[in-house]
Amino acid sequence: MAPWPELGDAQPNPDKYLEGAAGQQPTAPDKSKETNKTDNTEAPVTKIELLPSYSTATLIDEPTEVDDPWNLPTLQDSGIKWSERDTKGKILCFFQGIGRLILLLGFLYFFVCSLDILSSAFQLVGGKMAGQFFSNSSIMSNPLLGLVIGVLVTVLVQSSSTSTSIVVSMVSSSLLTVRAAIPIIMGANIGTSITNTIVALMQVGDRSEFRRAFAGATVHDFFNWLSVLVLLPVEVATHYLEIITQLIVESFHFKNGEDAPDLLKVITKPFTKLIVQLDKKVISQIAMNDEKAKNKSLVKIWCKTFTNKTQINVTVPSTANCTSPSLCWTDGIQNWTMKNVTYKENIAKCQHIFVNFHLPDLAVGTILLILSLLVLCGCLIMIVKILGSVLKGQVATVIKKTINTDFPFPFAWLTGYLAILVGAGMTFIVQSSSVFTSALTPLIGIGVITIERAYPLTLGSNIGTTTTAILAALASPGNALRSSLQIALCHFFFNISGILLWYPIPFTRLPIRMAKGLGNISAKYRWFAVFYLIIFFFLIPLTVFGLSLAGWRVLVGVGVPVVFIIILVLCLRLLQSRCPRVLPKKLQNWNFLPLWMRSLKPWDAVVSKFTGCFQMRCCCCCRVCCRACCLLCDCPKCCRCSKCCEDLEEAQEGQDVPVKAPETFDNITISREAQGEVPASDSKTECTAL
């Protein structure tokens, strides 16, 4: 892959129109380091400043100040002002507002429910595989393997609490040490950030909205990846998390507490349990090498059972298989032992859709996966539409100011920390970081919350989910209390360490810059978002997993050269942007590499060709499909048969940059899309009136 999506000359003058990850736009000097990427051929750029290759750009009425794509959009209020309305109008407006609020809460409810169902669907599709990842004995000795198992399992079950609870049960059963569990917890932290990234993909229809939403979602990913990149080696070297948490656990005499309050689940469970109910113990049993569990279904059939404990005599191959010598005997021929057997008598069946279908887990999971994604997508679109209609004019200004404005001068630095606390508190209330960050994503997309503000909220969410885990640990039974508490504390201190690394000093807020960079790339090449998701959450972890299974020699043999190349590219890139003169002429830009290694354009052509076959056949009946289709095709005209998409096409015409000569429209270089701004396809025409 390319060392950077668009790598060209390190230009000395950043104030020219440059083709960057976000297309061309004048960039501030500090940002030039990240966006100076062209496909120009080698030229002595230091001597003379060239105009962009598309000289027709002079035909554009160049705005004195080009919009920064990261600036929040102004949500114009097209409606009649309150003071200008008559009594009937005011009453109507009031009820409309109430209606919108009810609709918003309704869609929000189903959005959260669909996230829960999505998690269940992932568990049905990949839960057993996830459980088998844990039964790998190499986890104990290989922290890197532990990390990727944490990522893969959490991605597969779409729930960090599920993977963490498996780890806890394995630690309390002595199948895993706390030391071996820490990398898995780190991996689970990464894996949980996939949910809001998936949610961000649903906003693909509007390029500028998608830029913000995707960056807002991936800021979580980058925070987790960067934290692991620094803290995993530190932990392997010093075991600081293990030592600190052990000291805490040993110094306090904890009494079993109450269960963590299920606040959101109380509301969503009545609905979600009508769709599907899962027996999550099966995944834990598989993780703990229970052979019988491999044939069990995750779909819960019986909800009311009567259990009767009894002891039975069972034969064992030899006395070595006895639980203890005092519980083993022989009848002269066979060896026997006593086993506690729990007879389960089924009394009442569960009340959910799939209870009587007896479908395989994969089938149920696939059905639920498709349905939950559709509902998720539909709800998200409706939430965005309602918020878009509500957050206009004065309301938007007030909300934006409240959320995004800092405290007065001496206390400005405190704002972010308050946001961390708010994020933690909200996550504690909803009992899920995925739900909180997923709800945040569309707000970032429509421009209510800036990425700079979303970042501390996300960090707070990471803390909030660990406090929930600590409470859950305090409520666990005696034998599991110590291990579950220590693991929950490891998770907590890992996130605290990450925040200390990547938040207090503005310079170190790399996740924001990286997320914005990825947002720019994904806005221009929308297929890259899916590519990123597959690479970072599946391919890289699976590759490391495969190499780890092959042995540490193979892992080091492959890993060291890869890491070396990455470091080399990063160092070279840094030198190219900061002090290119120290480099030989050839290395001052990336032109020595073939185009496919330094630009996404050739890849874009390949993807466009590959998805071209879908473009004509893609028949969507609503905006939901249209957005999914646009994600695949990266094309506004992919939904020829859709009324809503026709509207989109028609509405784009008034969205172009003002030009002096209309005939120059034929030249693609002068459209805003070529400049990396809002593309022609991105007008926000509403298909349905609310």
């Epitope: 005092s326 005997w329 022989t330 009848d331 002269g332 021929i333 066979q334």
Partner: antibody, heavy 119, light 107 residues
């Protein structure tokens, strides 16, 4: 009631084999293990092995491994113990005994068969 | 193999006496010990199994106790018909093994 009736006394010469039978009655023959225990004159009890008539599975004491063979005839509800390569020290009373279900305890014993080995 | 050692080998007691016979295993046998009574010229009779469970029809004066390696057979009040040889036997591991026996004689 449960009864285990063994065959009569035997006199054998060293090197020969002896086959002692044990006829069971009063219970389901195939549901309990049958043990063979011997007692040399004036000595203690010594376990030789056991057979499960239901499947024909057997287990032997290491001391007698290769010399003793335990068999059953389910139709006749009879168990057999054959001891080969007899030596003078094999002179003993041979008991068959029914095992308690799942346990290595023996609740009913045969009257015993005296096997004398002398040249 | 597990060795079972009984003590004493001989015991003289009078009718009505409380008699205690001990049996020691060379390794942990849990509770898997049996006690038998054998009178001269007769087959052994099962008294106690699983260290302390009295077999059907066995008088209540016979009781067993112990676990692990040390076991005891107690006859609370010796009766004339109780003069016999008593054997302990383990069934924790194969091969099954018996103690050498304890002969209870009339004093």
């Amino acid at each position: 009631q449960v009864q285990l009736v063994e065959s009569g006394a035997e006199v054998k010469q060293p090197g020969e084999s002896v086959k002692v039978s044990c006829k069971a009655s009063g219970y389901t023959f195939t549901s309990n293990n049958l043990h063979w225990v011997r007692q040399a004159p004036g000595q203690g009890l010594e376990w030789m092995g056991a057979v499960y008539p239901g499947s024909g599975d057997t287990s032997y004491s290491q001391k007698f491994q290769g010399r003793v063979t335990l068999t059953v005839d389910k139709s006749a509800s009879t168990a057999y113990m054959e001891l080969s390569s007899l030596r003078s020290e094999d002179t003993a009373v041979y008991f068959c005994a029914r095992g308690l279900p799942y346990l290595g305890a023996m609740d009913y014993w045969g009257q015993g068969t005296l096997v004398t080995v002398s040249s | 193999d597990i060795q079972m050692t009984q003590s004493p080998s001989f015991l003289s007691a009078s009718v009505g006496d409380r008699v205690t016979i001990t049996c020691s295993a060379s390794q942990n046998v849990g509770i898997f010990v049996t006690w038998y009574q054998q009178k001269p010229g007769q087959s052994p009779k099962l008294l106690i199994y699983s260290a302390s469970s009295r077999y059907t029809g066995v008088p209540s004066r016979f009781s067993g106790s112990g676990s692990g390696t040390d076991f005891t057979l107690t006859i609370s009040s010796l009766q004339p018909e109780d003069f016999a040889t008593y054997y302990c036997q383990q069934y924790s591991r194969s091969p099954l093994s018996f103690g050498q026996g304890t002969k209870v004689e009339i004093k």
